[in-house]
Interface confidence: medium
């Protein structure tokens, strides 16, 4: 079997000019493509995987919301020579991420890292964004976690940050196939310059408290407190699977209009974000959709 | 059909500057990454530059690195290639191509540009 | 001096099979980047012969066919017509020089 192999990180590492073709294993009879993207309120970036697979084929596409960051996530296998092409790679160019313009800041400013590299997104060196609070959410908390996609034995991860909805989430995660998105929250501008080390204490969690001794004249306190020395139960999370919708593209001959963008175009939004998504701007599922070629 | 129509070439002196403009029709312009290739009389061709969809990445050749910019206006379907400090070498046929399925699939009719004293 | 070496001349007879080599290197067909042909007939534009090493566009006549192996590829014109008669370029892309890389391009000449 022969693949197509790439690997994308918020680049333009898939795009066809730089596609290879890989002879696979013997008894390797799938090829995948993964795609992993992510959708801040200030902008998104994807990552991207193809190769010799493994498993049965067919299609997994899912969209997850983990405190207002949300990810879409495709998952395509097949089983004929250089099927693992499929999937869109062309981007909804953010416009600068939605329009941001529309809302008002309301006061915390968060380290951002959207499509950055490891190195560029270290302590507080990334750009500062304002937050904002859209579609009836408020977005007060900052984030900092990881993206990581694992696809044809190849695992690509590239770091997160960004305003959300959460001031106080600690090592919260949402998976897909062959995909996490995970970190911490915290409260307080430009607090997410490294959370790596956030431990479950947050400031919403009531500290333990070493009661006096009752006096003996004094009636039963009618006011109780909760002690605990097991991690305190998080208020429930927000996160919530999505339906994501699919941009599939059968593998045509040149006339098919091909091009793509920096990132996935996976058409359609989630609740949440549909305010900035420019969704009138962009062709709906099936409509022109242009897998790039960057070259040659 | 794919149809590409670049203007703007002509006769400069070393040093000065042009603007080249490449109109699209026949397809979803604002969905396709661009390129500009050139083909200097009698010689290959050479890959200039390319940009985006969106027109948010671009990318360029060493060699005009620094003094040629490629832009688009999605809203007017056109392509542009500005073109400062110009050089001897630079004459050249310009072509405007679109990107597509792993290749360039569609191709203007090119713009010659003479760099000259 | 391309990227890509080609032969710079090339002939044939009505009907018979040419052949068109397209050398590169371990950073560019090597690393196993997808090879493309362009035609270029006289006094006009390129056009998109063979994509993704032997992909052929609609349109495009199944007397010419594209091969890929190692460090090299191919194009091979069957049947020969005197409309074959054209400029004709490889092109990859380049690990080393990040960028597409063309051929310097073969002249084919029918007799």
């Known amino acids: 079997l022969e693949c197509y192999s790439c690997v994308q990180k918020a680049d333009d590492g898939c795009s066809p000019n730089k596609m290879k073709t890989v002879k696979c294993a013997p008894g390797v009879d799938v090829c995948t493509e993964a795609v992993g993207a992510v959708e801040t309120i200030h902008g998104q970036f994807s990552l991207a995987v193809r190769g010799c697979g493994s498993g049965l084929p067919g299609k997994n596409d899912r969209g997850l919301d983990l405190h207002g960051l949300l990810a879409f996530i495709q998952l395509q296998q097949c089983a004929q020579d250089r099927c693992n092409a499929k999937l869109n790679l062309t981007s909804r160019a953010l416009d600068p991420a939605g329009n941001e313009s529309a809302y008002p800041p309301n006061g915390v400013e968060c380290y951002s890292c959207v499509g950055l590299s490891r190195e560029a997104c270290q302590g507080t060196s990334p750009p500062v964004v304002s937050c904002y609070n859209a579609s009836d959410h408020v977005y007060k908390g900052c984030f900092d976690g990881n993206v990581t996609l694992t696809a044809a034995n190849v695992t690509v991860s590239l770091p997160v940050r960004g305003c959300v909805q959460d001031e106080f989430c600690t090592r919260d995660g949402v998976t897909g196939p062959g995909f996490t998105l995970s970190g911490s929250c915290c409260q307080g501008s430009r607090c997410n310059s490294d959370l790596r080390n956030k431990t479950y204490f947050s400031p919403r969690i009531p500290p333990l408290v070493r009661l006096p001794p009752p006096e003996p004249t004094t009636v039963a306190s009618t006011t109780s407190v909760t002690t605990s020395t097991s991690a305190p139960v998080r208020p429930t999370s927000t996160t919530k699977p999505m339906p994501a919708p699919t941009s599939q593209t059968p593998r045509q001959g040149v006339e098919h209009e091909a091009s793509r963008d920096e990132e996935p175009r996976l058409t359609g939004g989630a609740a949440g974000h549909q305010d900035r998504s420019n969704s009138g701007q962009y062709p709906a599922k099936g409509g022109p959709q242009q897998p790039h070629n960057k070259g040659c | 059909e794919v149809q590409l129509l670049e203007s703007g070439g002509g006769l400069v002196q070393p040093g000065g500057s042009l603007r080249l403009s490449c109109a699209a029709s026949?397809?979803?312009?604002?969905?396709?990454?661009m390129s500009w290739v050139r083909q200097a009389p009698g010689k290959g061709l050479e890959w200039v530059s390319y940009?985006?969809?969106?027109?948010?990445?671009?990318y360029y050749a060493d060699s005009v690195k620094g003094r040629f910019t490629i832009s688009r206006d999605n809203s007017k379907n056109t392509l542009y290639l500005q073109m400062n400090s110009l050089r001897a070498e630079d004459t050249a046929v310009y072509y405007c191509?679109?990107?597509?399925?792993?290749?360039?699939?569609?191709w203007g009719q090119g713009t010659l540009v003479t760099v000259s004293s | 001096q391309s990227v890509l070496t080609q032969p710079p001349s090339a002939s044939g007879t009505p009907g018979q099979r040419v052949t068109i080599s397209c050398s590169g290197s371990s950073s560019n067909i090597g690393a196993g980047y997808v090879v493309h042909w362009y035609q270029q007939l006289p006094g006009t534009a390129p056009k998109l012969l063979i994509y993704d090493n032997n992909q052929r566009p609609s349109g495009v006549p199944d007397r010419f066919s594209g091969s890929k192996s190692g460090t090299s590829a191919s194009l091979a014109i069957s049947g020969l017509r005197s409309e074959d008669e054209a400029d004709y370029y490889c092109a990859a892309y380049d690990d080393s020089l990040n960028r597409p890389v063309f051929g310097g391009g073969t002249k084919l000449t029918v007799l």
């Open positions: 026949g397809f979803t312009f604002s969905s396709a990454w």
């Open positions: 940009i985006s969809s969106s027109g948010s990445s671009t």
């Open positions: 191509a679109r990107e597509g399925l792993w290749a360039f699939d569609g």
